[in-house]
């Protein structure tokens, strides 16, 4: 007899979701020797334990610690990148500058990067044909808590200058509502965090405006300030040539504004 | 017809090593974890660690943790505990138990068991 | 590591009795706790799984409930090829960890 199952509005949760994050802990201890102490089967264990036989409406930062207890990691705080709604450019940046780092490049966030995943409450099944969305079911769900908790957790170990990459082509570059709006802004600590540096991504080769002037870059500058944190903001008109130069920084071309 | 059938009773002298295989058929081995769980004579089950083929990755209890080696080939399908610096007290039935790499669910085949007999 | 104990040690019951063993945790383990059953010189074979889920071929005599710390197996009527050892096992983390054990012989 098929048991009634709940119907949610999003993708259900990723095909070999088990195999993908032990295999991606497995890749990750292997490359990354301060993390080599890591049991991937342990970080398995705790990463069912908090979500599986839950109800997906209804998962708490709470239900995630043993996952970020097993997963503590420590990057040099004056490195660290974030991003809104431009994740691609930001990790091609940290592959080249290998001192920095965005979220994805410590052992949880790389993990669970572009992947679902949900339970049912009171199974020991993972769902694999639906999950909540975050908007039409409802935001406690097992990886909008997961990102929420593992982003506060990223910026509240930020320290002297925070960079943040943002999206110059969107109507709303930054976005009170993404992660890096809710969530980051306001857990970068003032007393550890001396500025956050704003690189406003242009989209269009022919693109000269002052991005910086925006009323979402104004709006971001005023809730920094208002935290006792200083702003400053960037335009990258060519991300093209901002990535090459970050490759070869001593090529010719790479003197003038990029 | 899943099955798990293990090499035969072994007897050592203690300081030596033993190496005990488990043979999986009838189910995609790849697919499954391989715990290896022993059980002193009169005794209860002692879990002593578990494999995942797929990743070739393993862990163990703490308590066996520099003795214990446990692998397995994808090739034959076996999987491998082996115990090196045997001590009496290593004496016992060693079982070789499957479960699903995601541990959502118990030891659902075992196999038959291998006694191992430490003595001088 | 988590320690399970299980209660009683041993217990006498009749054909046609109700069983119940309990097994606590010391921590809590979320419903990640399975039943084995053992007869002499055989391996375990498990019985429920998820704390209240029955493994496949096992008759619905056997229930098992519970979550967090306390888990209970009971046995509704007890039959003849009943008369076993029977183990809980945690799987909410590692080490695995069983309980000690509880032998249910014939009074």
């Known amino acids: 007899v098929p048991r009634w199952r709940q119907q949610w509005s999003g993708p259900g949760t990723t095909k070999r979701f088990p195999e993908t994050v032990l295999a991606r802990c497995v890749k990750y201890t292997e490359i990354h020797p301060e993390m080599r102490h890591v049991d991937c089967q342990s970080v398995w264990d705790a990463f069912k334990g908090a979500f599986i036989s839950k109800h997906p409406c209804n998962i708490t930062e709470e239900d995630y610690q043993p996952l970020m207890k097993l997963g503590t990691q420590t990057v040099p705080c004056n490195k660290i990148l974030l991003w809104s709604r431009i994740k691609d450019l930001a990790h091609q940046f940290t592959q080249v500058q290998r001192d920095m780092f965005t979220l994805e490049d410590t052992l949880l966030g790389y993990l669970a990067d572009d992947l679902t995943w949900c339970g049912e409450f009171n199974t020991s099944k993972i769902n694999y044909q639906s999950c909540p969305d975050w908007r039409k079911d409802c935001s406690n769900n097992p990886v909008s808590v997961f990102w929420k908790t593992v982003s506060r957790r990223f910026a509240e170990a930020a320290c002297d200058v925070v960079h943040v990459m943002l999206n110059g082509s969107r109507s709303k570059i930054f976005d009170k509502n993404s992660t890096f709006g809710s969530v980051e802004v306001h857990n970068l600590q003032p007393e550890k965090v001396q500025t956050l540096e704003a690189w406003v991504i242009h989209g269009g080769r022919e693109d000269s405006r002052d991005l910086c002037q925006d009323p979402t870059i104004k709006e971001l500058e005023s809730i920094i300030s208002k935290r006792n944190i200083q702003f400053s903001c960037k335009n990258i008109y060519r991300p093209d040539k901002f990535l090459q130069c970050v490759k070869n920084p001593e090529d010719s071309s790479c003197t003038s504004e990029i | 017809q899943v099955q798990l059938v293990q090499s035969g009773a072994e007897v050592k002298k203690p300081g030596s090593s033993v190496k005990v295989s488990c043979k999986a058929s009838?189910?995609?081995?790849?697919?499954?974890?391989f715990s290896w769980v022993r059980q002193a004579p009169g005794q209860g089950l002692e879990w002593m660690g578990r494999?995942?083929?797929?990743?070739?990755?393993?862990n163990s209890a703490q308590k066996f943790q520099g003795r214990v080696t446990i692998t397995a080939d994808k090739s034959t399908s076996t999987a491998y505990m082996e115990l090196s610096s045997l001590r009496s007290e290593d004496t016992a039935v060693y079982y070789c138990?499957?479960?699903?790499?995601?541990?959502?669910?118990?030891?659902?085949?075992w196999g038959q068991g291998t006694l191992v007999t430490v003595s001088s | 590591d988590i320690q399970m104990t299980q209660s009683p040690s041993s217990l006498s019951a009749s054909v046609g009795d109700r069983v119940t063993i309990t097994c606590r945790a010391s921590?809590?383990?979320?419903?990640?706790l399975a039943w084995y059953q053992q007869k002499p010189e055989k391996a375990p074979k498990s019985l429920i799984y998820?704390?209240?889920s029955l493994q496949s071929g096992v008759p619905s005599r056997f229930s098992g409930s519970g979550s967090g710390t306390d888990f209970t197996l009971t046995i509704s009527s007890l039959q003849p090829e009943d008369f076993a050892t029977y183990y809980c096992?945690?799987?909410?983390?590692?080490?695995?960890?069983f309980g000690q054990g509880t032998k249910v012989e014939i009074k």
């Open positions: 096992q945690q799987y909410n983390s590692y080490p695995r960890t």
């Open positions: 138990a499957r479960d699903d790499i995601a541990a959502l669910g118990p030891f659902d085949y």
């Open positions: 998820a704390a209240s």
């Open positions: 009838g189910g995609t081995f790849s697919s499954y974890a």
């Open positions: 494999v995942i083929p797929f990743l070739g990755i393993a």
């Open positions: 921590q809590g383990i979320s419903s990640w």
